[in-house]
């Protein structure tokens, strides 16, 4: 039983990481700057132009470790890092793109990538 | 080796157009996309546009929207921008580009005059 | 459009200084900057992607560094070869641009 005066409403675990962010500010965000319970990430992906493009921002705790994880996906080049650190920790993550295929380089078959679209595109 | 070749020069009189070409070669054409800049003495380097290989899907810098026209002809692997309506203002060197994320491959670069 | 500012035209140096080029964006564009090196008579030719990324092939004395507005290509330990324009590119929107270059010459 809760005690007098307790909320029974499910209380939100305190947002205490600062990030960089930029592509991926949410709305309430100042100065590129954005709040999480989770982690700071900088990823590192070809967007449909095959040009290196880096975003950056905030993880919520739910889900983060799978996203973190960096699984590879088949014809999408990208490396994402997280940290939890320290405020804004994120400035100092370097991602690097996994290498090229051969077949890149041959004529061959094409391989279309399937990408989540950021607010820019090349 | 990725290398795209272009034409030394083109001499073109005033008000006529001209088609630059830029054959890649060693690498699937149609997986990277081919951009377009301008260069003139003194002025430093101009975006004009790219083309998706492709697709045939185009974006241009709105200063070059009415003076260039980006295409591809996929089986010989060759990008083609044509100019129009030249004056002394397009003489410049024009470069293909092509990049697929850590390369980055320029042409050589094709010289435009224009002169009567 | 985003305007890249290279404030210095010009620069001198002698082989074996360490010198730095800079590079500022009229807006935020996170660290989406390539650095093009360019020598007379040839293509520009790329050193650096987002921001600090150095190319393959490229000496390790090109280091790219800054985010957001402030970018900088540090040559430590210049060598002959070094002596060229040197153009800062943003391309985290449309259209590309361009920094107007900084000719790195022999003091």
């Known amino acids: 039983k809760k005690e007098d005066g307790e909320s029974t409403a499910p209380t939100a675990r305190p947002k205490v990481l600062r990030c960089k962010c930029h592509h991926h500010c949410p709305e309430d965000s100042v100065n590129n700057i954005c709040s999480t319970d989770g982690y700071c990430f900088t990823m590192i992906e070809e967007d449909d132009s095959g040009t290196p493009v880096v975003t950056s921002g905030c993880l919520g705790l739910e889900g983060s470790d799978f996203q973190c994880r960096d699984t590879p996906i088949p014809h999408q080049r990208r490396s994402i890092e997280c940290c939890t650190e320290r405020n804004e920790c994120n400035k100092d993550l370097h991602p690097t793109l996994p290498p090229l295929k051969d077949r890149d380089f041959v004529d061959g078959p094409i391989h279309h990538k399937h990408h989540h679209h950021h607010h820019h595109h090349h | 080796q990725v290398q795209l070749q272009q034409p030394g020069a083109e001499l073109v009189k005033p008000g006529a157009s001209v088609k630059l070409s830029c054959k890649a070669s060693g690498y699937t054409f149609t997986t990277y996309w081919m951009h377009w800049v301008k260069q003139r003495p003194g002025r430093g380097l101009e975006w004009i546009g790219r083309?998706?290989?492709?697709?045939?899907?185009?974006k241009y810098n709105e200063k070059f929207k009415s003076k260039a026209t980006l295409t591809v002809d996929k089986p010989s692997s060759t990008a083609c921008m044509q100019l129009s309506s030249l004056t002394s203002e397009d003489s410049a060197v024009y470069y293909c580009?092509?990049?697929?994320?850590?390369?980055?491959?320029w042409g050589t670069g094709t010289t435009v005059t224009v002169s009567s | 459009d985003i305007v890249m500012t290279q404030s210095q035209k010009f620069m001198s140096t002698s082989v074996g200084d360490r010198v730095s080029v800079t590079c500022k964006a009229s807006?935020?564009?996170?660290?989406?900057v390539f650095w093009y090196q360019q020598k007379p008579g040839q293509s520009p030719k790329a050193l650096i992607y987002a921001a600090s990324y150095r190319y393959s092939g490229v000496p390790d004395r090109f280091t790219g560094s800054g985010s957001g507005t402030d970018f900088t290509l540090t040559i430590s330990n210049v060598q002959s070869e070094d002596l060229a324009d040197y153009f800062c590119?943003?391309?985290?929107?449309?259209?590309?641009?361009f920094g107007d270059g900084t000719k790195l010459e022999l003091r």
């Open positions: 083309i998706d290989p492709n697709s045939g899907g185009t």
């Open positions: 580009a092509s990049r697929r994320g850590d390369i980055d491959v």
């Open positions: 590119q943003q391309y985290d929107s449309y259209p590309l641009t």
């Open positions: 807006q935020n564009v996170g660290t989406n």
